[in-house]
Amino acid sequence: KSPVFGPQEVSSVEGNSVSIKCYYPPTSVNRHTRKYWCRKGASGRCITLVSSEGYVSSNYAGRANLTNFPENGTFVVNIAQLSRDDSGHYKCGLGINSRGLSFDVSLEVSQGPELPNGTEVYTVDVGRTVTIKCPFKTENAPKTKALYKKIGQTSVLVIDSRNYVNPNYKDRIRLRIPGTGQLIFTVVIDRLRLSDHGLYLCQAGDGSNRDEKNADLQVLEPEPELVYEDLRGSVTFHCALGLEVANVAKFLCRVNSRETCDVVINTLGKRDSAFEGRILLNPQDKDGSFSVVITGLRKEDEGRYLCGAHSDGQLQEGWPIQAWQLFVNEESTIPRSPTVVKGVAGGSVAVLCPYNPKESQSLKYWCLWEGAQNGRCPLLVESQGLVQEQYEGRLSLLQEPGNGTFTVILNQLTTQDAGFYWCLTNGDTRWRTTVEIKIIEGEPNLKVPGNVTAVLGETLNIPCHFPCKFSSYEKYWCKWSNTGCQTLPSQDEGPSEAFVNCDENSRLVSLTLNPVTRADEGWYWCGVKQGHFYGETAAVYVAVEEKKVAGSRYVSPAKADAAPDEKVLDSGVREIENKAIQDPRLFAEEKVVADTGDQAGGSRASVDSSSSEEQGGSSK
């Protein structure tokens, strides 16, 4: 399908002008290539009428032009002095007329209505209000005032000053007679319907002395605003319906093939399930305006959208509406990224979030979509740091890999983390994207002790087991803070051959803190990554306590959720048995080591990656 988009139908009246805007993907090639407006002939060929290269056909000379706006990815064709002959089928496009990078536009030019002399013309959008002014002479001041609608050769009474109201106008029309000295009465019609369109006649008095005034009321369907957005991106519909409906329920609906309008979202709590997790209705301002944000745009989101106000929260004739025609460009600048990310309870996810690469300095955000109250999105983390304290130790936003993508890592997953999350920046709002986190059955791949208690001044060694499938990945430990996760210095992992013959035993990367200080207390993450792309993580909390005073049963230099049947080794090292660990099968080899011996030359914090055999054999 062509990525060029414009208005499908354009209608105007003889002698008037039209302005036709066409959209295209603003790639470098597209921005500079030829733009054209051509008319389709009976043969199927499309004859150029005006182009961006300066060509103007003789038929259009002096009344048409084409202007390219490369920075917006749009071009505009203006045509003046329209005649009935201009009605027909056209194309706006890029490149060569026959190439197919175009959009079909139908132009209809109609004859203006034949109106009686002195007719006042009122042009009003459907759902809005019109005030028809009716002048009269002094002698008709005390006499009956009335408004008629002309239907063919007959005149139908609409309202008069003797309290008659035509049933078609019930509850939405009033006739106002001014005080003495003012020689104009007015008729106000609210919530205009398309059927109100037509010629009206004001009348004051009767007989040959009566005052008459013609009024032509043109009730227009709102011209849909064209909206051109990228696949996977985001759109915002700003809806301003006026103060008169400020306190009425609002809605956004999409026109279907039957020309009815299906509610997408409304302020009464209704929401189309197709938009679950990717729509927000922003609260209205005191003037009654509101906005609807939709992210994660799909091709099937294309179509005509209406926003409106009605107590039922859905489209009703005669209430104000605003219209948009949404086109979703499949030649998207927004890269593909998973829309669903799966994790296991206790495990982790690493979510890749796209942003406009031209805005690398923009602030990055991640929020959790909540469906309650028309949707809302509390921020969880920003590139400046953590926002919600309940995510302490398990959520981090990383600027890597950069160049249009940032990463959000969430670990210690529970079923309550399942849901929809939005990637945001404070820059280009069209790059808002949605990801769904699903919690599935399974075990975390990385295994660490539950909680660890370290002793001041001594050495702490924390193991992290990883399966063979991660043998080629880079392993790391980092210390979490609310502004990120600071990677700890890594010891040389030894020759890469160590992982070539990976057996069924899990491999081990261990963190050593030597000597333990008060500042070491906090969350530590063990993780795997490939280059700047992050994989799984596991978190462990390290508490720091003073050394036990002599006389206690034994010195416990380091504890890691010790099990009841733990053994105290001669060296003062406690060995953790199977029960202490989240998964006994993988932790049979584990030791949390606190070495009270001489540590000269050891680093303050170090990471060692090796097989469990290399850690010193079995603990049994």
Partner: nanobody, 124 residues
């Protein structure tokens, strides 16, 4: 979390005007819904006004509608409350508050970051 500091309070005569400012530090507030609340002596803290992250949507307590205007300058990381036609019953400590909601319906319970307050006294 974001730190908020109010200023601009003081003594003013009934019918007068004041402009309160709330300067944020610690992080930018351009995705925060910001609000003003007040607490008169012996009364509960009450909502005054709020403004969404973009500045396009505002909301006011009925008692201040038409007299108070909330605005924000994201570039300066500051929120303002312009108070006109002040009445003695507007006397209170005024608190600035922030809510870390990118978008959507944010209730008055959702404000998590608070300033220390600035006293506004309106004499008759």
């Amino acid at each position: 979390q974001v730190q908020l500091v109010e200023s601009g309070g003081g003594l003013v005569q009934a019918g007068g005007s004041l402009r309160l400012s709330c300067a944020a530090s610690g992080r930018t507030i351009n995705t925060y819904v910001m609000g003003w609340f007040r607490q008169a002596p012996g009364k509960e803290r009450e909502f005054v006004a709020r403004i969404d992250w973009s500045g396009s949507s505002t909301d006011y307590a009925d008692s201040v509608k038409g007299r108070f205007t909330i605005s924000r300058d994201n570039a300066k990381n500051t929120v303002y409350l312009q108070m006109n036609s002040l009445k003695p019953e507007d006397t209170a400590v005024y608190y600035c508050a922030g809510s870390a909601y990118y978008s959507g319906y944010v209730t008055h319970r959702d404000f998590g970051s608070w300033g220390q307050g600035t006293l506004v006294t309106v004499s008759s």
